[in-house]
Amino acid sequence: APVPPGEDSKDVAAPHRQPLTSSERIDKQIRYILDGISALRKETCNKSNMCESSKEALAENNLNLPKMAEKDGCFQSGFNEETCLVKIITGLLEFEVYLEYLQNRFESSEEQARAVQMSTKVLIQFLQKKAKNLDAITTPDPTTNASLLTKLQAQNQWLQDMTTHLILRSFKEFLQSSLRALRQM
């Protein structure tokens, strides 16, 4: 697994550097998760041809993966800090059930999958500290999540492989948009 944020060689080499600001810490945390996702995607793409498959739509129908849209206030046009922050936190909370699903999907990258899941929990905490309007953040229903997890795990092998690929791709895209939006805040 990669070295967690704040523990890379640059930080070790520069002990007198200013401590990271909250924004820098969040940025670094997202990039750490993105690096983890890249490693997981490598294993997925090497193991199957899902990354080149044109049948993604078949599996996508079963999923309700969070997506960033213009109305969420995270794009440069119509940027709205509060609305966007709520969207990012809500989206990450919704991704948690899918990250749980990924936990048993990797052989050589099991640790990496766990690191992505735990780092996302930390990221949510960082962002919740930053958010003022916590009332607007809806937490997914645990019962709904449990039944979704059961449903995903009951899929045939091909659909499970495709679901893994789609979760990783969508999570990567969501984080990249979040990264860009947070840099405007």
Epitope: M68, C74, F75, Q176, R180
Partner: antibody, heavy 120, light 106 residues
Framework: EVQLVQSGGGLIQPGGSLRLSCAAS????????MIWVRQAPGKGLEWVSD????????YYADSVKGRFTMSRDISKNTVYLQMNSLRAEDTGVYYC?????????????WGRGTLVTVSS | DIVMTQSPSTLSASVGDRVTITCRAS??????LAWYQQKPGRAPKVLIY???TLESGVPSRFSGSGSGTDFTLTISSLQPEDFATYYC????????FGQGTKLEIK
């Protein structure tokens, strides 16, 4: 092999409109970040806009915001720069390029550039 | 926009000299900075990215350093083919460039 073939430049009067095209081959624009950069005659490079492949999210330099629109057609693997309300200071060579890497780090491929001249 | 200020705008040097170009960002950009070389009539070519990572195929006489707001590009021993214009570019948000440094023969 990655290639970016540009077209659409030319002479245009102030206040006019022009659309630049950039046809990509060797990679898919639907999973890459694209960028337009311009260079006025004898001057430096100026970032104009970029398009994050995810959700087609676009960003613009203050100098072109509200006048220029960057878009894409995934089926044609082509990106566009629609330029409206053109001014003399928009004159220059416009480069279409691709950001490298997942969190853009640098430009790894450039088009040959297309000359836009805004003059009456 | 993030403003990138590059200096000097022109630099006269001789083959074998060690030269340094600096670039300052109007806000912190972590290490999201690249250096490019451009020759007349050509598209720019990347030399360094992530502030200090040398692009493959680029001679080791080129090096970059810095983080946050202040960055430098150093050419340890100038070669005849190094006389060109150099630009820094941030990729933290958008992709603004410095105004360029023209490196000319003394």
């Amino acid at each position: 092999e990655v290639q970016l073939v540009q077209s659409g430049g030319g002479l245009i009067q102030p206040g006019g409109s022009l659309r630049l095209s950039c046809a990509a081959s060797g990679f898919t624009i639907s999973s890459n970040y694209m960028i337009w950069v311009r260079q006025a005659p004898g001057k430096g490079l100026e970032w104009v806009s970029d398009l994050y492949y995810y959700a087609g999210d676009t960003y613009y330099a203050d100098s072109v915001k509200g006048r220029f629109t960057m878009s894409r057609d995934i089926s044609k693997n082509t990106v566009y720069l629609q330029m409206n309300s053109l001014r003399a200071e928009d004159t220059g060579v416009y480069y279409c390029a691709r950001w490298a890497d997942d969190h853009p780090r640098y430009i790894d491929h450039w088009g040959r550039g297309t000359l836009v001249t805004v003059s009456s | 926009d993030i403003v990138m200020t590059q200096s000097p705008s022109t630099l006269s040097a001789s083959v074998g000299d060690r030269v340094t170009i600096t670039c300052r960002a109007s806000q912190g950009i972590s290490s999201w900075l690249a250096w490019y070389q451009q020759k007349p009539g050509r598209a720019p070519k990347v030399l360094i990215y992530k502030a200090s990572t040398l692009e493959s195929g680029v001679p080791s006489r080129f090096s970059g350093s810095g983080s946050g707001t202040d960055f430098t590009l150093t050419i340890s021993s100038l070669q005849p083919e190094d006389f060109a214009t150099y630009y820094c570019q941030q990729s933290w948000l958008g992709g603004s460039f410095g105004q360029g440094t023209k490196l000319e023969i003394k």
